[in-house]
Interface confidence: low
């Protein structure tokens, strides 16, 4: 069947790297500057991105590849592909649309993205405040003082962290 | 940054090869050329090898100039060397977004008898 | 393959001044063109891609433009620090048509 279909199809010769020129007899072509075919019997080549602005050149564009982009200092990759940059924050802070604000009391952002998230709430857990939370740290909660006895351990690590982005339930 | 190394004093028709050590970035990442350019003159292209692996040469430089690379480095192989072929040699990082954006300081090639 | 031709060869100009250098390309190179400046014993240090981006940590005094077969370079406020040779390079690669490099030009800075 694939013979067969590259009988009928000359363009399915064409490889990566080349597209198949209806122009000049369905020969296979070179892609032209600044852009790439990744797969073989390709009727036109696609444009190669540009890093341009915030956005820096993390892989550069082949004849048979797509350019990556990252993001310059100071910002994050935000979508699929790193569609756009997002402006970095401190720790203590999350980016509104008024700029970089510090965490109201009660949460934080261990990171420079996301959201300020509240603290771990320890008698949930029936447990005690053992390290006081800050903008940019969790609390560190305890074992409730009835727990402690000789040979207990004294710190439980935090709850893990919820993901960016998601509000508590 | 860029490094060349292996330049040196050889006679006509004696082969040679050029290597450039990057440190910072990856030569999966980037495009890397050889530019050379003779004693006050201009800078002249020698060729390329791109992210993939793929090779573009000067027309002038093909057959007598080979560019290989390693995870590190990236070589020039040349044969047949000419007194024209003395030449301060460049390698350079860069690709189809922002032209040679890094240069290594050169290393000069003289060829006499 | 591609021909990159630049004038003038040399330009004197006093501190102060402006300097314009011309780059002509045999055909149209989509904005695909950088410059750069190499003073002597020293590697080429890229000033400009795309034709007009100015690279990072470059002065605002050294400004470009051009599309198609035309392009230039301008140095406004000349420095004595300026005085080095200039090129402009076409570099997109992908279809075999070559790198190219103009001639260069000399700027003098009286």
């Known amino acids: 069947f694939e013979r067969t279909r590259s009988l009928q199809d000359p363009c399915s010769n064409c490889p990566a790297g080349t597209f198949c020129d209806n122009n000049r007899n369905q020969i296979c072509s070179p892609c032209p500057p600044n852009s790439f075919s990744s797969a073989g019997g390709q009727r036109t080549c696609d444009i190669c991105r540009q890093c341009k602005g915030v956005f820096r050149t993390r892989k550069e564009c082949s004849s048979t590849s797509n350019a990556e982009c990252d993001c310059t200092p100071g910002f994050h990759c935000l979508g699929a592909g790193c569609s756009m940059c997002e402006q970095d924050c401190k720790q203590g802070q999350e980016l509104t649309k008024k700029g970089c604000k510090d965490c109201c009391f009660g949460t934080f952002n261990d990171q420079k993205r996301g959201i300020c998230r509240p603290w771990t709430n320890c008698s949930l857990d029936g447990k005690s405040v053992l390290v006081n939370g800050t903008k940019e740290r969790d609390v560190v909660c305890g074992p409730s003082p009835a727990d402690l006895s000789p040979g207990a351990s004294s710190v439980t690590p935090p709850a893990p962290a919820r993901e960016p982005g998601h509000s508590p339930q | 940054s860029l490094e060349e190394s292996g330049g040196r004093l050889v006679t006509p028709g004696t082969p040679l090869t050029l290597t450039c050590t990057v440190s910072?970035?990856?030569?999966?990442?980037?495009?890397m050329s050889w530019v050379r350019q003779a004693p006050g003159k201009g800078l002249e292209w020698i060729g390329y090898?791109?992210?993939?692996?793929s090779l573009y040469y000067a027309s002038w430089a093909k057959g007598r100039f080979t560019i290989s690379r390693t995870s590190t480095t990236v070589d020039l192989k040349m044969t047949s060397l000419t007194t024209e072929d003395t030449a301060t040699y460049f390698c350079?990082?860069?690709?189809?977004?922002?032209?040679?954006?890094?240069w290594g300081p050169g290393t000069l090639v003289t060829v006499s008898s | 393959d591609i021909v990159m031709t630049q004038t003038p060869a040399s330009v004197s100009e006093p501190v102060g001044g402006t300097v314009t250098i011309n780059c002509q390309a045999s055909?149209?190179?989509?904005?695909?063109l950088a410059w750069y400046q190499q003073k002597p014993g020293q590697r080429p240090k890229r000033l400009i891609y795309?034709?007009?981006d100015l690279a990072s940590g470059v002065p605002s005094r050294f400004s470009a433009s051009g599309s198609g077969t035309e392009y230039a370079l301008t140095i406004s406020d000349l420095e004595s620090a300026d005085a080095a040779t200039y090129y402009c390079?076409?570099?997109?690669?992908?279809?075999?048509?070559?790198?190219?490099f103009g001639g260069g030009t000399e700027v003098v800075v009286k």
């Open positions: 350079a990082r860069g690709g189809l977004t922002y032209g040679f954006d890094l």
């Open positions: 910072g970035f990856s030569l999966n990442d980037y495009w």
């Open positions: 090898i791109d992210v993939g692996g």
């Open positions: 055909e149209d190179i989509s904005s695909y």
């Open positions: 795309g034709a007009s």
């Open positions: 390079h076409y570099y997109a690669t992908i279809s075999g048509l070559g790198v190219a």
